[in-house]
C-alpha cells in the first residue's frame, strides 16, 4: 500500500502494467484485465445501503498518487490499496473498511443485517 509520505511526482513506468478489474473495467479491457501506466488498485466502500462493495482496476499515472493515498472522506467509509510490483498484483490486495466512529452510529441510518 502506498503511504502518505511518498513522493507526489510518480515516476513513469517503462512498461505497461496489467491489472485485474472488477466493477471498474474500462472499454479497452479484455477478460477483466485492464492496462495502465500507473497503478493497480483494489477498493472497498459502503454502498448506499451500507453493504461493502469491492471494486478493482487500473489507475492512470496522472492523479493516481493522490487517489492511492486513501485520504479519509467525512461520512464515507472507504479504503483503497494500490500496487505496481507485478501484473495483476491487485488480486492480492485486501483493503478493509475503516472502523465505524461512534458518531456514525448516530448520524448514519440504522442497518439491520
Amino acid at each position: 500500500k502506498k503511504e502518505d509520505g511518498e513522493s507526489t511526482a510518480p515516476t513513469p513506468r517503462p512498461k505497461v502494467l496489467r491489472c485485474k478489474c472488477h466493477h471498474h473495467c474500462p472499454e479497452d479491457s479484455v477478460n477483466n484485465i485492464c492496462s495502465t501506466d500507473g497503478y493497480c488498485f483494489t477498493m472497498i466502500e459502503e454502498d448506499d445501503s451500507g453493504l461493502p462493495v469491492v471494486t478493482s482496476g487500473c489507475l492512470g499515472l496522472e492523479g493516481s498518487d493522490f487517489q492511492c493515498r486513501d485520504t479519509p472522506i467525512p461520512h464515507q467509509r472507504r479504503s483503497i490499496e494500490c500496487c505496481t510490483e507485478r501484473n495483476e498484483c491487485n488480486k492480492d490486495l485486501h483493503p478493509t473498511l475503516p472502523p465505524l466512529k461512534n458518531r456514525d452510529f448516530v448520524d448514519g441510518p440504522i442497518h439491520h443485517r
Epitope: K15, S35, T36, L61, R86
Partner: antibody
Framework: QVQLQQPGAELVKPGASVKLSCKAS????????MQWVKQRPGQGLEWIGE????????LYNQKFKGKATLTVDTSSSTAYMQLSSLTSEDSAVYYC?????????WGLGTTLTVSS | DVVMTQTPLSLPVSLGDQASIFCRSS???????????LHWYLQKPGQSPKLLIY???NRFSGVPDRFSGSGSGTDFTLKISRVEAEDLGVYFC?????????FGSGTKLEIK
C-alpha cells in the same frame, strides 16, 4: 545499444514443434515486455502475444492460443516461443520485439519453413 | 479485434515530393489513461520494421524531422515532407490500445 538476436532460419517437419529464441542485450531485460509477431508474405503483421520477463505474465492473441507458448530465461536474457503441431500455415518470419507501451526495437526475425 | 485500414496500398512518388499515408481504426484508440497508442513503422526489403512515430506524433530517436504524425480517435496520418531514396519501403500503422494489438496492411512507398 538495444539488440534482439534471433537465428536466421529454422526448417521443421509438419506435425513437429519448434522453439524459437530471442537473446536481448543493451537494456535491462525485465524492464520491458517481449512480444512476438508473425509475418507471412502478402499477409501483413500479426501479433502473437507478449510476456513480461519480470513475472512471466503472458497475454496471447486468442488466434494463437494453443499454438504458441511464450517463456523467458532471465539468467540469459533470452525469450522463447514454442510453436506446436506445425503446418505449412506456420511458415513465416517470426519477430521478437521489445515493448513498453509500443514496440521500439525488433529482432531481425527467424524464417520458419515447415516442409517434409 | 480492432481493424486498421491503411490507404493507399501503394504510393508512387518522386524524390523531394511530399507523401501522406492514412490509417483508420475500427474503434477509438484513445486508451482509458488518456493516451493514444497509435504508432508508425517502416520496413525496408529484407529488414525488420523500424519505429518512426509513437503515440500519434512523437518522433522516435534518430528519425529525421521530415517525418511527422497527426490525428486523433480513429483517423491518423503520417506525412513525409520531402521524400528521400532511403524512405522507400513499406509503412505500417499499429495500435497498442486494445488487445490483441493489430497492424495496418501496409503502404508501399515507391519511386514514380
Amino acid at each position: 545499444q538495444v539488440q534482439l538476436q534471433q537465428p536466421g532460419a529454422e526448417l521443421v517437419k509438419p506435425g513437429a514443434s519448434v522453439k524459437l529464441s530471442c537473446k536481448a542485450s543493451g537494456y535491462t531485460f525485465t524492464s520491458y515486455w517481449m512480444q512476438w509477431v508473425k509475418q507471412r508474405p502478402g499477409q501483413g503483421l500479426e501479433w502473437i502475444g507478449e510476456i513480461d520477463p519480470s513475472d512471466n505474465y503472458t497475454l496471447y492473441n486468442q488466434k494463437f492460443k494453443g499454438k504458441a507458448t511464450l517463456t523467458v530465461d532471465t539468467s540469459s536474457s533470452t525469450a522463447y516461443m514454442q510453436l506446436s503441431s506445425l503446418t505449412s500455415e506456420d511458415s513465416a518470419v517470426y519477430y521478437c520485439a521489445r515493448f513498453g507501451y509500443y514496440v521500439d526495437y525488433w529482432g531481425l526475425g527467424t524464417t520458419l519453413t515447415v516442409s517434409s | 479485434d480492432v481493424v486498421m485500414t491503411q490507404t493507399p496500398l501503394s504510393l508512387p512518388v518522386s524524390l523531394g515530393d511530399q507523401a501522406s499515408i492514412f490509417c483508420r481504426s475500427s474503434q477509438s484508440l484513445v486508451h482509458s489513461t488518456g493516451n493514444t497508442y497509435l504508432h508508425w513503422y517502416l520496413q525496408k526489403p529484407g529488414q525488420s520494421p523500424k519505429l518512426l512515430i509513437y503515440k500519434v506524433s512523437n518522433r522516435f530517436s534518430g528519425v529525421p524531422d521530415r517525418f511527422s504524425g497527426s490525428g486523433s480517435g480513429t483517423d491518423f496520418t503520417l506525412k513525409i515532407s520531402r521524400v528521400e531514396a532511403e524512405d522507400l519501403g513499406v509503412y505500417f500503422c499499429s495500435q497498442s490500445t486494445h488487445v490483441p494489438f493489430t497492424f495496418g496492411s501496409g503502404t508501399k512507398l515507391e519511386i514514380k
